[in-house]
């Protein structure tokens, strides 16, 4: 230790009165680059948040119902390259959700100008029962919906072949799966290529002749034996899905019409949806034709605008 | 169906060889591993190497042949054998195999089918 | 590295006879095993696949068995033809290494 101690002092010996001005001078300028790091620091968090607010207005989680298809008619195909994939695509349009608070209610017109003549009026005198009602139409403040198409298509020269066993180096493997779906007697056929992918333990394989991928996903398992050892792998088709189109759009109701002010209001939610499709129901009241009315007085309910 | 062996030849040590295996009667498919074996005189079968006749086109070597001795196909019926830095070790007659898989496996495999070989001397 | 071992080197038996050679393998080689015929000037001949099954073609004289790491090929009413070479030979499919593919020694069978 003593002999460290030396060595220390020998050191500050040899340094000049220069240097340590030079040091001061460092320790300054360390100084000002830990507050500008600071500050940066605050900026990138800051920035951080308002990205993660922005990215959560652009995430839509959808329910979409079930669809009944029509099948039209059958396409004869001009070549063999349009036997080798079924494609398909499908529109999908989000339902807008409204949520109408207590107090509130929604008037759809059947008519646009009605509702842009019921909206100008702004304030309107409602007979509820006994009560004289004030109420204010106001355009409905319509949050973002989306619009896109999902195009799918799913190849017949492809299949996906999923659990396959890591009992093998990358390269046997690969000729392990092209040997045994190129077996006929286990209804594989000539096989064009073998994407192999050890991590996942999953392949797409690719065959030469169409027909052999539907042949062999007719069971949902293929037998893959390895040293005598059988592994049955599991067999789906090989689909692509792109999405295409993709829209967002927002705006308000040209036909529907928000209605406040029915706060006080404790009646039933359906006597009183009917009393305001009678007031506007009437031509005198700036109303006209009625399609839907939506009361909310106790809890509040969601209503899904649609194009 | 038959394999023939060609390009052996006498060289001086150092010297490079390039060996063809040419396949009539069958082209190359999935269930064939196409390999080299050579035999020096008077002693037993060594294997050198295989490359898998399917789409992967997988290369197999015996740890002393990496290096210096590599395996092709150069089209679905033939296949060929690089040798460089060759010794007076390496003087054999290098047989072409076709490998067979025999089961609906690929467990089971046999060489069911050899060319007559082709004779390398290396000598100065 | 996969290592065959051929035993005996040399064998001889008077026609009618029975030889038996026997392959060991350094790993286990799952019956994946052939055994093959060779005569002076000659390529070698496929006799037996998967350790036990016989090549079409080959008489049933020729008899292989054996699993694991122990193998065993048997040759019964033996005929003068039946002097030759006979060498084991396996590939393996393995996680650690290449398809390692090994010849054993030979074994040579006199006929008297």
């Known amino acids: 230790m003593e002999a460290d101690k030396d060595d220390t002092q020998q050191i500050l010996k040899e340094h000049s009165p220069d240097e340590f001005i030079k040091d001061e001078q460092n320790k300054g300028l360390i100084d000002e680059i830990t507050k500008k790091n600071i500050q940066l620091k605050k900026e990138i968090q800051k920035l951080e948040t308002e990205l993660q607010e922005a990215t959560k207005e652009f995430q839509i989680k959808e329910d979409i119902p079930e669809t009944k298809m029509k099948f039209l008619s059958v396409e004869t195909p001009e070549n063999d390259s349009q036997l080798s994939n079924i494609s398909c695509s499908f529109q999908v349009s989000s339902k807008v959700p409204y949520e109408i608070q207590k107090g509130q209610a929604l008037i759809t017109f059947e008519k646009e100008e009605v509702a842009q003549n019921v909206v100008s009026m702004s304030k309107h005198h409602v007979q509820i029962k006994d009560v004289n009602l004030e109420v204010t139409a106001k355009p409905v403040p319509l949050n973002s919906g989306v619009r896109f198409q999902v195009y799918v298509e799913v190849s017949k020269m492809k299949i996906n072949v999923t659990e396959i066993p890591d009992t093998l180096r990358e390269d046997q493997m690969r000729d392990k799966l092209e040997l045994s779906f190129s077996k006929s007697r286990n209804g594989g056929g000539e096989v064009d290529r073998v994407d192999y992918d050890r991590q996942s333990g999953s392949a797409v394989i690719t065959f030469v002749e169409i027909g052999v991928a539907d042949k062999i996903l007719k069971k949902k398992e293929y037998p893959l034996y390895i040293n005598q050892t059988c592994h049955r792998v599991t067999v789906s088709p090989y689909t692509e899905i792109h999405l295409k189109k993709y829209q967002i759009f927002s705006g308000t109701s040209k036909r529907t019409v928000l209605l406040t002010g029915m706060e006080g209001i404790q009646m039933d939610e359906e006597i009183v949806e009917d009393l305001i499709n009678i007031h506007f129901q009437r031509a005198k009241n700036g109303g006209g034709e009625v399609d839907v009315v939506k009361c909310s007085l106790g809890q509040p309910h969601i209503a899904y605008f649609e194009e | 169906q038959s394999l023939e062996e060609s390009g052996g030849d006498l060289v001086k040590p150092g010297a490079s060889l390039t060996l063809t295996c040419t396949a009539s009667?069958?082209?190359?498919?999935?269930?064939?591993?196409m390999c080299w074996v050579r035999q020096a005189p008077g002693k037993g079968l060594e294997w050198i190497a295989c490359?898998?006749?399917?789409?992967?086109?997988?290369t197999y070597y015996a740890s002393w042949a990496k290096g210096r001795f590599t395996i092709s196909k150069t089209s679905s019926t033939t296949v060929t054998l690089q040798m460089t830095s060759l010794t007076a070790a390496d003087t054999a007659t290098y047989f072409c195999?076709?490998?067979?898989?025999?089961?609906?496996?690929?467990?089971?495999?046999?060489?069911?089918?050899w060319g007559p070989g082709t004779l390398v001397t290396v000598s100065s | 590295a996969l290592v065959m071992t051929q035993t005996p080197s040399s064998v001889s038996a008077a026609v009618g006879g029975t030889v038996t050679i026997n392959c060991q393998a350094s790993?286990?080689?799952?019956?994946?095993l052939a055994w093959y015929q060779q005569k002076p000037g000659q390529p070698p001949k496929l006799l037996i696949y998967?350790?036990?099954n016989l090549e079409s073609g080959v008489p049933s004289r020729f008899k292989g068995s054996g699993s694991g790491t122990e193998y065993t090929l048997t040759i019964s009413d033996l005929e003068c033809d039946d002097a030759a070479t006979y060498y084991c030979?396996?590939?393996?499919?393995?996680?650690?290494?290449?398809?390692?593919?090994?010849f054993g020694g030979g074994t040579e069978v006199v006929v008297k």
């Open positions: 009667g069958f082209s190359f498919s999935s269930s064939y591993y």
């Open positions: 195999a076709r490998e067979y898989s025999y089961d609906d496996y690929g467990d089971f495999w046999g060489a069911n089918l």
């Open positions: 490359i898998y006749a399917g789409s992967s086109g997988s």
């Open positions: 790993q286990n080689i799952y019956t994946n």
């Open positions: 030979q396996s590939s393996l499919y393995s996680r650690i290494a290449d398809r390692a593919n090994a």
């Open positions: 998967g350790a036990s």
